[in-house]
């Protein structure tokens, strides 16, 4: 699920239903955001690489009491093969950089879109 680039000929392959739903949820969050997401909570930035789903979950799981991202947290847990709990960090975190949840979600969405488009466009 984490390998999206380099689609085989003749064209791109659509995502699994789970990944499609994750992308749609990220789109909903970014498009429907009015007040600061999660009251402007800050999370650790991550390296958007092969283990990004677990890293994203490890970062977002430290945000509590924010209903807007609860569905995203549940979805990400489905992509991460190991159990993730608050306070847990992997080497994929950029531990010196914290960003707002809204920016984190936007970055994750942009990265997923980029991966799909790399397989689609010349």
């Amino acid at each position: 699920l984490t390998c999206l680039g380099g689609f085989a000929s003749p064209g791109p392959v659509p995502p699994s239903t789970a990944l499609r739903e994750l992308i749609e949820e990220l789109v909903n969050i970014t498009q429907n955001q009015k007040a600061p997401l999660c009251n402007g909570s800050m999370v650790w930035s991550i390296n958007l690489t092969a283990g990004m789903y677990c890293a994203a979950l490890e970062s977002l799981i430290n945000v509590s009491g924010c209903s807007a991202i609860e569905k995203t947290q549940r979805m990400l847990s489905g992509f991460c093969p190991h159990k993730v709990s608050a306070g847990q960090f992997s080497s994929l975190h950029v531990r010196d950089t914290k960003i707002e949840v809204a920016q984190f979600v936007k970055d994750l969405l942009l990265h997923l879109k980029k991966l799909f488009r790399e397989g689609q466009f010349n």
């Epitope: 003749p10 791109p12 488009r117 689609q120 010349n122």
Partner: antibody
């Protein structure tokens, strides 16, 4: 609200080229792909190709490679389609549409541009 | 290329009728199937996405079903304003392809 405003109808000579425009508003232009469709009574709705406005990357239907050239200008939120070496077969209504990612539906369409190729 | 076949080509209905429009893909496209309505002299408009998901602003009388290669668009009580051509679209793989359409007309 989201709008895709297309350029007006064109009457062009065989062998000539024409450039159609599609100006997007009401959303962030680089967040969505722009896809182009051709509609004729004989062939119905055909997908010509798509462009990622952020990178300028393109994807074409093999049938329209060499016929259509897709470009986009981020600064004006406008996508363009140049049609080359026109023949009567290119007479059609052309639509621009937006799609988040290629497997998504075409959720907004332009009003269409009628192109007539005639001497 | 994935070929999308729609039937019937034309459907003559009476207001209040329940109608079903069929779309068949030449290969398995899972639920990557979208439906559009095009009224005379208008652009197409999205009715249903991913075979069965409703679209905001579209009347609830429109519904979709199916998966794999066989799909159906249903209108549970046709209104006079539903007259037009209905297209199904393969969203699974390039090139994106559409059916030839089903024309819905009033008797």
């Amino acid at each position: 609200q989201v709008q895709l405003q297309q350029s007006g109808a064109d009457l062009v000579r065989p062998g000539a080229s024409v450039t159609l425009s599609c100006k997007a508003s009401g959303y962030t232009f680089i967040d969505y792909e722009i896809h182009w469709m051709k509609q004729t009574p004989v062939h119905g709705l055909e997908w010509i190709g798509a462009i990622d406005p952020e990178t300028g990357g393109t994807a074409y239907n093999q049938k329209f490679k060499g016929k259509a050239i897709l470009t986009a200008d981020k600064s004006s939120s406008t996508a363009y389609m140049e049609l080359r070496s026109l023949t009567s077969e290119d007479s059609a209504v052309y639509y621009c549409t937006r799609i988040l990612l290629y497997y998504y539906p075409m959720d907004y369409w332009g009003q269409g541009t009628s192109v007539t190729v005639s001497s | 290329d994935i070929v999308m076949t729609q039937s019937p080509a034309t459907l003559s209905v009476t207001p209040g009728d329940r109608v079903s429009l069929s779309c068949r893909a030449s290969q398995n496209i899972s639920d990557y199937l979208h439906w559009y309505q095009q009224k005379s002299h208008e652009s197409p408009r999205l009715l249903i996405k991913y075979a069965s998901q409703s679209i905001s602003g579209i009347p609830s009388r429109f519904s979709g079903s199916g998966s794999g290669s066989d799909f159906t668009l249903s209108i549970n009580s046709v209104e006079p304003e539903d007259v037009g051509v209905y297209y199904c679209q393969n969203g699974h793989s390039f090139p994106l392809t559409l059916g030839a359409g089903t024309k819905l007309e009033l008797k």
